[in-house]
Amino acid sequence: DTEIKVNPPQDFEIVDPGYLGYLYLQWQPPLSLDHFKECTVEYELKYRNIGSETWKTIITKNLHYKDGFDLNKGIEAKIHTLLPWQCTNGSEVQSSWAETTYWISPQGIPETKVQDMDCVYYNWQYLLCSWKPGIGVLLDTNYNLFYWYEGLDHALQCVDYIKADGQNIGCRFPYLEASDYKDFYICVNGSSENKPIRSSYFTFQLQNIVKPLPPVYLTFTRESSCEIKLKWSIPLGPIPARCFDYEIEIREDDTTLVTATVENETYTLKTTNETRQLCFVVRSKVNIYCSDDGIWSEWSDKQCWEGEDLSKKTLLR
């Protein structure tokens, strides 16, 4: 009764198509699969960035797989062949592992790469990234930004740089069609006559870095003798009302009365007859139903009432 064995996949490699972190893992079927013609061979693929404690694991019948990686670090991957138990009259048979690695050989000491990279997707419409030059680099150093997301044929270079002292320190992006809810890859590289400059890679999703405009049209409405309803409107732009959370800051007679977070464009406030002045401001943020993260907007203009008994009339600006 001979032991059933299977070879690992052949020609296992990681291919970089130039998408700044979106890589192809590909392989060929193992040698000597003739005995298992009736079988559907599967492959177990494990991969990770160097230094990560956990492997991502995929089981597939295909000869390729694609995923995003952090190109600031190396990548390691391993794959083996799986023969399901149906093919072997018993337990599943696994081949030995085939292994491969990939990394972009760096140029330059890490301190030369851009510092404090910050990207904001203003009002879900305009992407702007800014950075500071690397430590110890001279003014002749210039940085260039490239970006890619699924849907673009190839990586594109920034065409509208923000400059300071002749150096590129940021990028205003053009309209980015169908670019949210998918990984957005950026590389900032550099050049200098003086020394080699380290490239930096960044990956994020645009909906997670949205900074909305502040809410508008703040109003007061008397609901009852001891309640006032604060209302506002969503800012102009493409973000639907269902995507907003709000933070309100209410001041009564120069003392902070309430800070609250709400999901709707209203807030009901309990008041006393002694209140002489009431002011509030609101800011907005994309909520967990539309993104995993976000940036608070600036505060709205302040809306106040003062000088008349709050209990006597409806208050509108």
Partner: antibody, heavy 116, light 108 residues
């Protein structure tokens, strides 16, 4: 397997120049940078500089006026030159491969004595 | 230049003991760029722990590394005779790249 081997003169006269060669095997110089590090009892491990896979260099500022690095990718060799040696340059000189921003393989080192 | 100060400079411990070596940086170092090397007499240094906490290939699991900012440690749980060596921390963050002065670990 990956190997690096330093070679050069064991003895250098004061004020003379030192030339070392690092011959590598098991990897390509077009894919990896190579650093030079020296070690002496008085000064410990000192980084001298690096030649990157693309051929550009970074030097320790303390040695920038005295050190030059170059390479021949086709011969798998990296060259190190240091001028104006003095007695305190006596050390073991190592070449080391750069991988993942660390020195993952080192040569066995070559001892250089500066003496008249 | 980032100065790395290791302590103690000499450490004597018995087989089976747990030992800790510390490395303090004069300014902050990214954990990705702090490494440890082991060197035995007559040999070149060997990469031992990379990026603060990742063991290099072939390093026994009794070794571990941790830390952030300016304070980093290498720990050996249950010291073995073959661990006798000098251990160096190294920062790859800023030029010039620098090493600690080393901790010589002796077996009692």
């Amino acid at each position: 397997q990956v190997q690096l081997q330093e070679s050069g003169p064991g003895l250098v006269r004061p004020s003379q120049s030192l030339s070392l060669t690092c011959t590598v095997s098991g990897f390509s110089l077009t894919s990896y940078g190579v650093h030079w590090v020296r070690q002496s009892p008085g000064r410990g491990l000192e980084w001298l500089g690096v030649i990157w896979s693309g051929g550009s260099t970074d030097y320790n500022a303390a040695f920038i006026s005295r050190v030059t690095m170059s390479k021949d990718n086709s011969k798998n060799q990296v060259f190190f030159r240091m001028n104006s040696l003095q007695a305190n340059d006596t050390a073991v000189y190592y070449c080391a491969r750069d991988r993942y921003d660390a020195f993952d393989y080192w040569g066995q080192g070559t001892t250089v004595t500066v003496s008249s | 230049e980032i100065v790395l100060t290791q302590s103690p400079s000499i450490l004597s411990a018995s087989v089976g003991e747990d030992v800790t070596i510390t490395c303090t940086a004069s300014s902050s170092v990214s954990s990705s760029y702090l490494h440890w090397y082991q060197q035995k007499p007559g040999s070149a240094p060997k990469l031992w722990i990379y990026s603060t906490s990742n063991l290099a290939s072939g390093v026994p699991s009794r070794f571990s590394g941790s830390g952030s900012g300016t304070s980093f440690t290498l720990t050996i749980s249950s010291l073995q005779a073959e661990d006798a060596a000098t251990y160096y921390c190294h920062q790859y963050h800023r030029s010039p790249l620098t090493f600690g002065a080393g901790t010589k670990l002796e077996i009692k």
